[in-house]
């Protein structure tokens, strides 16, 4: 048995890192291997994450993290029953994948403007809190050449746009994603996509 | 505002015990690692111990390994040194601090106001 | 275990005068460092934190620089409150570790 990908981590800097790699072969991830994971500092505790399949040569491990803070440093080892197959260590505020925001809803009672309105996925007590920046990725559903981002580059989860701007008649949906600047972190996962329609009509003298 | 009262100090002779009290308030304690800061009288700053905010991780000083032990008490509000064996050296002031993010354990934008530890016979 | 050490361990600067302390790691930190102030008798002050981040309610004359190893605490116009001792600080690994300090006194 042998890793043909090493595993890549990345953190949510809160509780939990996501660990993915590539085996040489088919492998029932679960049934065959497991990540050790242990703090780097004195003798703290060793902590065991069973893998799941992420397709047919790929796994993905969810690790459980005693609150993550910019200190820690973990050690990584990969083990099929009692063969080591891969020995590595992971900072995980050096690889921080921020949560997906959450939430996302449109408002269109007001007349010429889309509202958009979304949740930061992370607690106010936390520093990625006042941190992230935002994409909102809007579509047309019935024509994908039609789509455009928008980038929330202030700290308010909101974005407004005319209505004008969007097709009459047409079904629009959104999706929006986070990254982090300080951190300089990847892009979040997308949000679950809303969708809503797009009711606006021009004003009979400017038609 | 963030308030943390440190209490317990005294005066112990060498191999003794005391335990330490930080009383908190003004956020949410939860959420938050906390740690032990001394300073030797006329000296800088050492760092004793952090437990972690859901107290599932402690971490301590080489100097006072199995020796102290950090704990908390989440619905007290109350953070807890236990230092056990004590040595002169370990006469300081103690401080209880909080760091300024959930997510961060070193950037102590709270500190109480300190008790002080005197080991001697 | 990495090592924090500061320089000059004292100095004595006039009111008005820009003043700077550094801070070497003995291994790449980042930019994972705070700065403190201890006035005699009293608890210490956060003032910078990420290196370069003035906390808040912390005049703007004093500031931080630096990432990696080498780091400085600069104080643009010395006032008389600014007499105390300073601490540099890293984590960005365990254990946590200070600075030796540096006592700043007023000519």
């Known amino acids: 048995m042998k890793v043909l990908q090493e595993p890549t981590c990345v953190s949510d800097y809160m509780s939990i890192s996501t660990c993915e790699w590539k085996m040489g072969g088919p492998t029932n991830c679960s049934a065959e291997l497991r990540l050790l994971y242990q703090l780097v500092f004195q003798s703290s505790e060793t902590h065991t994450c069973v893998p799941e399949n992420n397709g047919g040569v790929g796994c993905v491990c969810h690790l459980l993290m005693d609150d993550v803070v910019s200190m820690d440093n973990y050690t990584l080892d990969l083990w099929a029953g009692q063969q080591l197959l891969w020995k590595g260590s992971f900072k995980p505020s050096e690889h921080v994948k921020p949560r997906a925001p959450g939430n996302l809803t449109v408002h269109t009672n007001v007349s010429d403007t889309v509202l958009l309105t979304w949740s930061n996925p992370y607690p106010p007590d936390n520093y990625l809190y006042n941190d992230l920046t935002y994409a909102v990725n809007i579509w047309n559903e019935n024509d994908l050449a039609d789509s455009r981002i928008h980038n929330v580059t202030y700290l308010k989860p909101t974005l407004r746009i005319p209505a004008s701007t969007l097709k009459s008649g047409i079904s629009y949906r959104a999706r929006v994603r986070a990254w982090a600047q300080h951190y300089n972190t990847t892009w979040s996962e997308w949000s679950p996509s809303t969708k809503w329609y797009n009711s606006y009509r021009e004003p009979f003298e400017q038609r | 505002q963030v308030q943390l009262q440190e209490s317990g100090g005294g005066l112990v002779q060498p191999g003794g015990s005391l335990r330490l009290s930080c009383a908190a308030s003004?956020?949410?304690?939860?959420?938050?690692?906390l740690t032990w800061v001394r300073q030797a009288p006329g000296k800088g700053l050492e760092w004793v111990s952090t437990?972690?905010?859901?107290?599932?991780?402690?971490l301590y000083a080489d100097s006072v390994k199995d020796r102290f032990t950090i704990s908390r008490d989440n619905a007290k509000n109350t953070l807890y040194l236990l230092m056990n064996s004590l040595k002169p050296e370990d006469t300081a002031v103690y401080y209880c601090?909080?760091?300024?993010?959930?997510?961060?354990?070193?950037?102590?934008?709270?500190w109480g106001q300190g008790t002080t530890v005197t080991v001697s016979s | 275990d990495i090592q924090m050490t500061q320089s000059p361990s004292s100095l004595s600067a006039s009111l008005g005068d820009r003043v700077t302390i550094t801070c070497q790691a003995s291994?790449?930190?980042?930019?994972?460092l705070a700065w403190y102030q201890q006035k005699p008798g009293q608890a210490p002050r956060l003032l910078i934190y990420?290196?370069?981040r003035l906390q808040t309610g912390v005049p703007s004359r004093f500031s931080g620089s630096g990432s990696g190893t080498s780091f400085t605490l600069t104080i643009s116009g010395l006032e008389t409150e600014d007499l105390a001792t300073y601490y540099c600080?890293?984590?960005?690994?365990?254990?946590?570790?200070f600075g030796q300090g540096t006592k700043l006194e007023i000519k």
């Open positions: 601090v909080k760091p300024l993010y959930s997510n961060f354990a070193g950037d102590f934008g709270s």
């Open positions: 003004g956020f949410t304690f939860s959420s938050y690692s």
């Open positions: 437990i972690k905010a859901r107290g599932g991780t402690t």
């Open positions: 291994q790449s930190i980042s930019s994972y």
């Open positions: 990420g290196g370069s």
């Open positions: 600080q890293q984590d960005y690994s365990w254990p946590l570790t």
